[in-house]
């Protein structure tokens, strides 16, 4: 069953290679637990960058060694990429899936183009 | 070790109302759903709802709207029943159980059942 | 509501031979997310119900690998390849396809 995530179509990371963007979903039903996935995709290739399952009143835990974090608000999830690099640079798609109580719900966003550029290096002082 | 203890039998007079506790232990309280299930002496499992422990919101069987109500205190790891205007119809076996996401939402951990009966 | 129908009893089964218990749902369990929303569990006798498989095939920890079930979206069997006195019990499929959760009438396994 699908359902619709909206998500935006662009935004720049910061200066620390910080990216934060909202992830809103439309609840076909009472979700109490849902289940968020970060993808990023890349000529083509989509791989997972992080994924977080969540009971609604709780905090959205990302696994430790992951680079987001995040928080919920009703049926919004703000999310937050650290660590990027220009390299990075990419789309980066939402994934939503209401896992309890069933029926089950899974929606994609259309993605967020994150733009990350490398600050420029100090110049040596003599 | 998981466990959920629930409290001892009850009989009961009609019309009056009951509440039954089932106390967890051995695992974080507020990582798991926790449902209700009613055994009509000997005979199947009926689904009464769930609740989740971090901010008390239930999900329930309409067939059992108005009759039970479920609760929880976080600070004792309890989940709570209450079943009203009580009728012969409720007599039965009422479990607890623990939801695991892992088996997809499968209830994993059973208490050991509270058993009520309505006699006047 | 999802009915789920099971036969009262099984044919008596002797220790050591294998046993079958069927369950059919009124709608089909198979989500288009590839996962089928059937379980099993297991009641014995003077005891809470067990849970023995969820996601229709998978056993639950614990649960020796002489139990095992498949099925399609509607009809399922749990199959017990090398039955023990301790297998004993009723034996109850479920669904959690869609609320509410709802399960079979139960099967009795018995022993010649």
């Known amino acids: 069953k699908a359902m619709h995530v909206a998500q935006p179509a662009v935004v720049l990371a910061n200066s620390r290679g910080t990216a934060s963007f909202v992830c809103e979903y439309a609840s076909p039903g009472k979700a109490t637990e849902v289940r968020v996935t970060v993808l990023r995709q890349a000529d083509s290739q989509v791989t997972e960058v992080c994924a977080a399952t969540y009971m609604m009143g709780n905090e959205l835990t990302f696994l430790d060694d992951s680079i987001c974090t995040g928080t919920s608000s009703g049926n919004q999830v703000n999310l937050t990429i650290q660590g990027l690099r220009a390299m990075d640079t990419g789309l980066y798609i939402c994934k939503v899936e209401l896992m309890y109580p069933p029926p089950y719900y899974m929606g994609i966003g259309n993605g967020t183009q994150i733009y990350v550029i490398d600050p420029e290096p100090c110049p040596d002082s003599d | 070790e998981v466990q959920l203890r629930q409290s001892g039998p009850e009989l009961v007079k009609p019309g009056t109302s009951v509440k039954i506790s089932c106390k967890a232990s051995g695992y974080k309280f507020t990582d798991h759903f926790i449902n209700w299930v009613k055994q009509n002496h000997g005979k199947s499992l009926e689904w009464i709802g769930d609740i989740n422990p971090n901010n008390g919101g239930t999900n329930s069987n309409q067939k059992f709207e108005g009759k039970a109500t479920l609760t929880v205190d976080k600070s004792s790891s309890t989940a709570y029943m209450e079943l009203r205007s009580l009728t012969s119809e409720d007599s039965a076996v009422y479990y607890c159980a623990r939801l695991r996401r892992e088996y997809f939402y499968a209830m994993d951990y059973w208490g050991q059942g509270t058993s009520v009966t309505v006699s006047s | 509501d999802i009915v789920m129908t099971q036969a009262a009893f099984s044919n008596p089964v002797t220790l050591g031979t294998s046993a079958s218990i069927s369950c059919r749902s009124s709608?089909?369990?198979?989500?288009?997310?590839?996962?089928?929303?059937l379980y099993w569990y297991l009641q014995k006798p003077g005891q809470s119900p067990q849970l023995l498989i969820y996601?229709?095939?998978n056993l639950a920890s614990g649960v020796p690998d002489r139990f095992s079930s498949s099925g399609s979206g509607t009809d399922f069997t749990l199959r017990i390849s090398r039955v023990e006195a301790e297998d004993v019990g009723v034996y109850y499929c479920a669904q959690n396809l869609e609320l509410p959760l709802t399960f079979g009438a139960g099967t009795k396994l018995e022993l010649k």
């Open positions: 996601q229709m095939s």
């Open positions: 709608k089909s369990l198979l989500h288009s997310n590839g996962i089928t929303y």
